[in-house]
């Protein structure tokens, strides 16, 4: 069951009384009436705040990143922790908070004229360097409009897939990030068994297209754990 | 200003599923989290599943678990919920919901109902 601790940072249309109106006519959108609240208090405050899991920096919040909590600790074992301020000590990008990123080990300001080409000269220097990659934010997400104005074919550089073109995704190759395609219908798919295990892949595939998850072949189902072909399969 | 309409609800027999369509404007889709909650007559909203904004966590209730699944299609802008092997008991109003990535997210972000703005609803009932 799901604890319900409310994140004061994102307090939207509090409800009305419980069986309140079920929305005004005429509006596409209302407040929430009449909600089931798990685990009681519905405003309890940030200082009981739970770590959330995490297997990339895209599942955690805009002032996050994902990383073993402790230093040097189980890769296996991720959760979200609060982003670096400007001066802080950093490994990638998402490590710095909003208006920063990652330069030489330090979170610097992310000055509008020059970030672009910073980030580009990452890339070429640092070619195979993990520390220094641009690990992305998220299939769903958006970028900056100050950094990238049209969106990548396939092939091209990315931070997170919606630098990319319709019909690709952002995903690692090698020790950067580029567009590829989404997968199609019968093509195969990782499936990932373990909690942040897709953070090791060298080769990243997109994931399922629309309609269609993720699946053990089922001509596959007698072979053994290890050789379970996944292949995009329809709901 | 976000805009939620809700479309696909109707009348199904037991056994039967329904798919929930989810259709989004004013806002940017990729940001946001995309929920479901449900509200059957004379009881209070719950919720049923979300899509968080990456599109990688997806959560379930435990009384929609195995039957129900919620995707989205950035290139739509259109959430979605399939309802498979529909139960008297999933009769209900059911309501697409959208919520903002948030600065710090918590196990509980994706089913607190007020960080969610909302579209009026479409009705499922499952009946014989």
């Known amino acids: 069951t799901l604890n319900s601790v409310l994140n004061s940072n994102a307090i939207k249309n509090l409800p009305p009384p419980l069986g309140g109106a079920a929305g005004h006519p005429g509006s596409a959108v209302s407040a929430a009436p009449g909600i089931l609240y798990p685990g009681g208090n519905k405003y309890q405050t940030i200082d009981n705040y739970q770590p959330y899991p995490c297997a990339e920096d895209e599942e955690c919040g805009t002032d996050e990143y994902c990383a073993s909590p402790t230093r040097g600790g189980d890769a296996g074992v991720q959760i979200c922790l609060a982003c670096r301020k400007r001066r802080k000590r950093c490994m990638r990008h998402a490590m710095c908070c909003p208006g920063n990123y990652c330069k030489n080990g330090i979170c610097v300001s992310s000055d509008q004229n020059h970030f672009r080409g910073e980030i580009e000269e990452t890339i070429t220097e640092s070619f195979g360097n993990d520390h220094s990659t641009l690990d992305g934010y998220s299939r769903r997400t958006t970028l900056s409009s100050k950094m990238y104005h049209t969106k990548g074919q396939e092939g091209s550089v990315c931070l997170r897939s919606s630098d990319c073109a319709s019909g690709l995704c952002c995903a690692r190759h090698f020790w950067s990030k580029i567009c590829k395609p989404v997968l199609k219908e019968g093509q195969v798919c990782t499936k990932h068994r373990r909690k942040g295990s897709h953070g090791l892949e060298i080769f990243q595939r997109c994931y399922c297209g629309e309609g269609l998850s993720c699946r053990i072949q089922k001509d596959h189902h007698q072979a053994s754990n290890s050789s379970r072909l996944h292949t995009c399969q329809r709901h | 200003e976000v805009q939620l309409v809700e479309s696909g609800g109707g009348l199904v027999q037991p056994g039967g599923s329904l798919r929930l369509s989810c259709a989004a404007s004013g806002f940017t889709f990729g940001d946001y989290a995309m929920g479901w909650f449900r509200q059957a007559p004379g009881k209070e909203r719950e919720f049923v599943g979300a899509?968080?904004?990456?599109?990688?966590?997806?959560t379930y209730a435990d009384s929609v678990k195995g039957r129900f699944t919620i995707s989205a299609d950035n290139s739509k802008n259109t959430a979605y919920l399939q309802m498979n092997s529909l139960k008297p008991e999933d009769t209900a109003v059911y309501y697409c919901?959208?919520?903002?990535?948030?600065?710090?997210?918590?196990?509980?972000?994706?089913?607190?109902?007020?960080?969610?703005?909302w579209g009026q609803g479409t009705l499922v009932t499952v009946s014989s």
């Open positions: 899509i968080d904004w990456s599109g990688r966590r997806i």
């Open positions: 919901a959208a919520a903002p990535r948030p600065k710090r997210v918590s196990v509980s972000y994706f089913s607190t109902a007020s960080n969610y703005d």
